[in-house]
């Protein structure tokens, strides 16, 4: 595939990544799939600055990120190491709360209204953010 050197239309460039901010809501798995179909992934927050950048663009709205523990330990969707990486959980979170009455616990992470993170039921229809890295090979065939 060809290397992507600039962001697609309606995506925002920041520090050699491109971001797309939804204005509608989907369950986490549907949001994850949406990003994959765009040759991207749900946003992976690796630094203070990236957190602040995303926070600025989403505003005070619950928004999915690419972090989940559906298979046990917390994992970033792009393989970034969770244990040694940046974290911004609200105090007392994640708590895998079962008291919501929707079955199961809370396995998907989202930005809350103040930007800090919370785990929630993955079926909730929250907004989401897709991210793709510039300079990575795109899946589109090269133009002949």
């Amino acid at each position: 595939g060809s290397e992507r050197t600039c962001c697609p239309v309606n995506w925002v460039e920041h520090e050699r990544s491109c971001y797309w901010f939804s204005r509608s809501g989907k369950a986490w798995a549907d949001a994850d799939n949406y990003c994959r179909l765009e040759d991207a992934h749900l946003v992976v927050v690796t630094s203070w600055e990236e957190q602040k950048f995303v926070q600025h663009h989403i505003g005070p709205v619950n928004t999915w990120m690419g972090l989940h523990d559906q298979n046990g330990p917390w994992k970033w969707v792009d393989g970034t190491d969770y244990e040694t990486g940046f974290k911004n959980w609200r105090p007392e979170q994640p708590d895998d709360w079962y008291g919501h009455g929707l079955g199961g616990g809370e396995d998907c992470a989202h930005f809350t209204d103040d930007g800090r993170w919370n785990d929630d039921v993955c079926q909730r229809p929250y907004r989401w953010v897709c991210e793709t890295e510039l300079d990575k090979a795109s899946q589109e065939p090269p133009l002949l």
């Epitope: 203070w48 600055e49 950048f53 926070q55 911004n88 105090p91």
Partner: antibody, heavy 121, light 107 residues
Framework: QVQLVESGGGVVQPGRSLRLSCAAS????????MHWVRQAPGKGLEWVTV????????YYADSVKGRFTISRDNSKNTLYLQMNSLRAEDTAVYYC??????????????WGQGTLVTVSS | DIQMTQSPSSLSASVGDRVIISCRAS??????LNWYQVKPGKAPKLLIY???TLQTGVPSRFSGSGSGTDFTLTINSLQPEDFATYYC?????????FGQGTRLEIQ
């Protein structure tokens, strides 16, 4: 009411170490990020370091990286700053300050009165 | 590092005056800009956070505006207790950085 009280300052020779403490009261210490900010005599404010409410993230100014270590004991409601290999340019009043959130906000809504550190031979 | 530049470095004004202090960032910091008031021998005081939100207990004569790289602190109808040094501070990037300060003196 929120109170932050620094201690541990004093006169120390270059190359030596000092540990500052900040005793917090009047709020749930374990829910807030904490910072150290300093002001050298006749100079402006300089941010030094931050620690998240749970210690999960720590950041330092380049001028102190590798020499200073921030830590906290939530069971004692106390913030610490371990200062090693002190230099004359570290001479300042050191303030502990509360982050308005758990760490990322970096707006300092409450400050202590400060403790003076003088590095001199 | 993000450099913060305040202007003027000092200014003289009288009680009742309107004063504007400017702060410029070396790159966009969106709205992550805070203002502090510092008096000799006293702990610094947060006045405004996130560009324009007044901290609880701060008089309404203080206001903030701006976005991106250019920000202002406005003090309407100066009071005697307002004579102090004012600092802007960005919280967008690490290291967190302050402006060099603006000293507001009685004329």
């Amino acid at each position: 009411q929120v109170q932050l009280v620094e201690s541990g300052g004093g006169v120390v020779q270059p190359g030596r170490s000092l540990r500052l403490s900040c005793a917090a009261s009047g709020f749930t210490f374990s829910s807030y990020g904490m910072h150290w900010v300093r002001q050298a005599p006749g100079k402006g404010l300089e941010w030094v370091t931050v620690i998240w409410y749970d210690g999960s993230n720590k950041y330092y100014a380049d001028s102190v990286k590798g020499r200073f270590t921030i830590s906290r004991d939530n069971s004692k409601n106390t913030l610490y700053l371990q200062m090693n290999s002190l230099r004359a340019e570290d001479t300042a009043v050191y303030y502990c300050a509360r982050d308005s959130l758990s760490g990322i906000a970096a707006a300092f809504d409450y400050w202590g009165q400060g403790t003076l550190v003088t590095v001199s031979s | 590092d993000i450099q913060m530049t305040q202007s003027p470095s000092s200014l003289s004004a009288s009680v009742g005056d309107r004063v504007i202090i400017s702060c410029r960032a070396s790159q966009s910091i969106f709205s992550y800009l805070n203002w502090y008031q510092v008096k000799p021998g006293k702990a610094p005081k947060l006045l405004i956070y996130d560009t324009s939100t007044l901290q609880t207990g701060v008089p309404s004569r203080f206001s903030g505006s701006g976005s991106g790289t250019d920000f202002t602190l406005t003090i309407n109808s100066l009071q005697p207790e307002d004579f102090a040094t004012y600092y802007c501070q960005q919280s967008y990037g690490i290291p967190i950085t302050f402006g060099q300060g603006t000293r507001l003196e009685i004329q």
